[in-house]
C-alpha cells in the first residue's frame, strides 16, 4: 500500500519520492531495506537523501532494491517503501515495456505529452524530445515547459515518445530520459471479449533466484477508445495491493497501444529479488471489460544455470 515503483537507467540521474507525505518541517530518514543501513544526507555521496527525496547521482545497476523512508511526525512515524530498479542502457533503439511510463492519449484538440517525473528534477528548458528514437523536428512539434505539444495530430503520431533533459545538482550535470507511449483517440471503435496475447495459458516462466523478473500481462479489447477495460495481476487469487509483499509490484499506469488498430493494455508485474517461495505462487493475468473476464495463469520455475565448458 505504501510502496512505489521507480526505475531508471544506469549512469543517469534518478530521484525518488517517499510515498508518505508530511509537512516540510518533518524529518525524513531513508534506509536501504536489505541491510537496514541509513542513507547519508551529505551531497558528496553518489546516493544521498534530501528530505522527501532520495537521489542517485548517477544511478548504478547495483543500486536496485527496496528503500525505506520514515517520515517522523509529532504523533507517529509514517513508513513508506521505494522499490527501485536500475537497468543497463539498451544498445538498440527499442524501449522495453518495463522502462515505459503510463500511456497518454491525445486528439486533435488536446495533444500534450508530459515528460514523466520531471517535476522531481532541477532542470532548465528546453527539453529534447524523440519519437521512436528519432529527434523530433518540424513546426508541428513544440516543446513547452515540461510537455510536448503536437499540432494537427494524426494517427501516425502514435508511438513512443522520449524526453531528455539535464538535472543540475551543485554545478554537476546529469542526464535523464523518460519514455511513454502516446495514442491517438479514434472516434470510430468497437469492443470485444478480452483477448490475452501474453502470457500464454498455463505458461511456465523460468526465473533466476536472487534476480529480478518481469511478467507482462497484455490484452486487446477491440478498436478505438475503450470505456471500461483493465488488465491486472493476481497472486494466488489475491490483488497485488492486498497480497502485502513489497518486492512484488505491478506497474502503475497501463500502456494502451494500437497495434493493427486494436486497443491493447499492458500491465507489468515486477518481482524484485526472486525467492524460492515465489515459485510456489500462482500468477494470474486478468483482462476484463464490459463483455467479461479472461484469465491466464503463469507459474515460475527455477532456471537451471547452463554449464560452460572451455
Amino acid at each position: 500500500k505504501f510502496s512505489k515503483q521507480s526505475w531508471g537507467l544506469e549512469n543517469e540521474a534518478l530521484i525518488v519520492r517517499c510515498p508518505r507525505q508530511g509537512k516540510p518541517s518533518y524529518t525524513v530518514d531513508w534506509y536501504y531495506s536489505q541491510t537496514n543501513k541509513s542513507i547519508p544526507t551529505q551531497e558528496r555521496n553518489r546516493v544521498f537523501a534530501s528530505g522527501q527525496l532520495l537521489k542517485f547521482l548517477p544511478a548504478a545497476v547495483a543500486d536496485s532494491g527496496i528503500y525505506t523512508c520514515i517520515v517522523r511526525s509529532p504523533t507517529f512515524n509514517r513508513t513508506g517503501y521505494a522499490n527501485v530498479t536500475i537497468y543497463k542502457k539498451q544498445s538498440d533503439c527499442n524501449v522495453p515495456d518495463y522502462l515505459m511510463y503510463s500511456t497518454v492519449s491525445g486528439s486533435e484538440k488536446n495533444s500534450k505529452i508530459y515528460c514523466p517525473t520531471i517535476d522531481l528534477y532541477n532542470w532548465t528548458a528546453p527539453l529534447e524530445w524523440f519519437k521512436n528514437c528519432q529527434a523530433l523536428q518540424g513546426s508541428r512539434y513544440r516543446a513547452h515547459k515540461s510537455f510536448l505539444v503536437i499540432d494537427n495530430v494524426m494517427t501516425e503520431d502514435a508511438g513512443d515518445y522520449t524526453c531528455k533533459f539535464i538535472h543540475n545538482e551543485n554545478g554537476a550535470n546529469y542526464s535523464v530520459t523518460a519514455t511513454r507511449s502516446f495514442t491517438v483517440k479514434d472516434e470510430q471503435g468497437f469492443s470485444l471479449f478480452p483477448v490475452i496475447g501474453a502470457p500464454a495459458q498455463n505458461e511456465i516462466k523460468e526465473v533466476e533466484i536472487g534476480k529480478n523478473a518481469n511478467l507482462t500481462c497484455s490484452a486487446c479489447f477491440g478498436k478505438g477508445t475503450q470505456f471500461l477495460a483493465a488488465v491486472l495481476w493476481q497472486l494466488n487469487g489475491t490483488k497485488i495491493t492486498d497480497f502485502g509483499e513489497p518486492r512484488i509490484q505491478q506497474e502503475e499506469g497501463q500502456n494502451q497501444s494500437f497495434s493493427n488498430g486494436l486497443a491493447c493494455l499492458d500491465m507489468v508485474l515486477r518481482i524484485a529479488d526472486v525467492k524460492e517461495e515465489d515459485l510456489l505462487l500462482q500468477y494470474d493475468c486478468l483482462a476484463l471489460n464490459l463483455h467479461g473476464l479472461r484469465r491466464h495463469t503463469v507459474r515460475l520455475s527455477r532456471k537451471n544455470p547452463i554449464d560452460h565448458h572451455s
Epitope: 500500500k1 505504501f2 512505489k4 519520492r17 510515498p19 508518505r20 507525505q21 508530511g22 509537512k23 516540510p24 518541517s25 518533518y26 524529518t27 517522523r72 511526525s73 509529532p74 504523533t75 513508506g80 517535476d119
Partner: antibody, heavy 116, light 113 residues
C-alpha cells in the same frame, strides 16, 4: 501561482450524497497532501480529513468516518470529497486546503445546502 | 482529540490599539523531534476564505503585515496585533497543526470601537 478551484454550490435533499471537486494548478499536485475543511453558518472551522495525493491514501476525522470519502485523480490534478447520508446540519461551506505548515492555500469554498 | 480554546470570543478596540488573542490547547503542540510548535493562526473576513497569518506558532506567512505576531509554546499561545487597523476587522482562529484530527479554536471576532 498556486490556485485551488472548487466546483459550484449544491442543493441536496436529506439522505442524498454530494461530491465536491478541487482542481489544483500552479504546483506539482502529487507533492502536497490535500485537506478538506468545512464551516457551518456562524460556526468554527472543522477538519474533515486529508489525502496523500501521491499514493491516494486518505485519513478521515472521527466525526466523518463512514460518511466521507476523499479521492484524487492525479492526471487531472483534482481532489474530491464525497459526503453521504446528508442531514440538515451538513449545510456548510466546504473548503479544500493544501497541506503544508498551516494551510496557506485554500479553495474558494463550495456551499452545500441540505434541505427537504 | 486536541481541544483548542480561544479567548476572548469577541473584542472591540480602537484603531492603533494593541490587541491580544490567546489560545490554549488541551495537549502540547510542541514536537520534541524538531522543537517546532505546530500551531497556526488564521484571519477570516465575513464571506471570505480563511487566510494563514502565522504557522509554527511564531513564523509569519509571506505577505502578512509585520503588525501581526505569534508567540507561545506547548499549550499556551498568543496572537498579537501591535496596532489595530480598520482592515483587521475579522474573526481569528487558532489551529492545532500537530496531530489528527486537526482542530480549530472557536474564533475571536475583532471589531473597531
Amino acid at each position: 501561482q498556486v490556485q485551488l478551484v472548487q466546483s459550484g454550490a449544491e442543493v441536496k435533499k436529506p439522505g442524498a450524497s454530494v461530491k465536491v471537486s478541487c482542481k489544483a494548478s500552479g504546483y506539482t499536485f502529487i507533492n502536497y497532501g490535500m485537506n478538506w475543511v468545512r464551516q457551518a453558518p456562524g460556526q468554527r472551522l472543522e477538519w474533515m480529513g486529508w489525502i496523500n495525493t501521491y499514493i491516494g491514501e486518505p485519513t478521515y476525522g472521527d466525526n466523518f468516518k463512514g460518511r466521507v470519502t476523499i479521492t484524487r485523480d492525479t492526471s487531472a490534478s483534482t481532489a474530491y470529497m464525497e459526503l453521504s447520508s446528508l442531514r440538515s446540519e451538513d449545510t456548510a461551506v466546504y473548503y479544500c486546503a493544501r497541506e503544508g505548515e498551516g494551510f496557506a492555500y485554500w479553495g474558494q469554498g463550495t456551499l452545500v445546502t441540505v434541505s427537504s | 482529540d486536541i481541544q483548542m480554546t480561544q479567548s476572548p470570543s469577541s473584542l472591540s478596540a480602537s484603531v492603533g490599539d494593541r490587541v491580544t488573542i490567546t489560545c490554549k490547547s488541551s495537549q502540547s503542540l510542541l514536537y520534541s523531534g524538531n522543537q517546532n510548535n505546530y500551531l497556526a493562526w488564521y484571519q477570516q473576513k465575513p464571506g471570505k476564505v480563511p487566510k494563514l497569518l502565522i504557522y509554527g506558532a511564531s513564523t509569519r506567512e509571506s505577505g502578512v503585515p509585520s503588525r501581526f505576531s505569534g508567540s507561545g509554546s506547548g499549550t499556551d499561545f498568543t496572537l498579537t496585533i501591535s496596532s489595530l487597523q480598520p482592515e483587521d476587522v475579522a474573526t481569528y482562529y487558532c489551529q492545532n497543526d500537530h496531530s489528527y484530527p486537526y482542530t480549530f479554536g472557536g474564533g475571536t471576532k475583532v471589531e473597531i470601537k
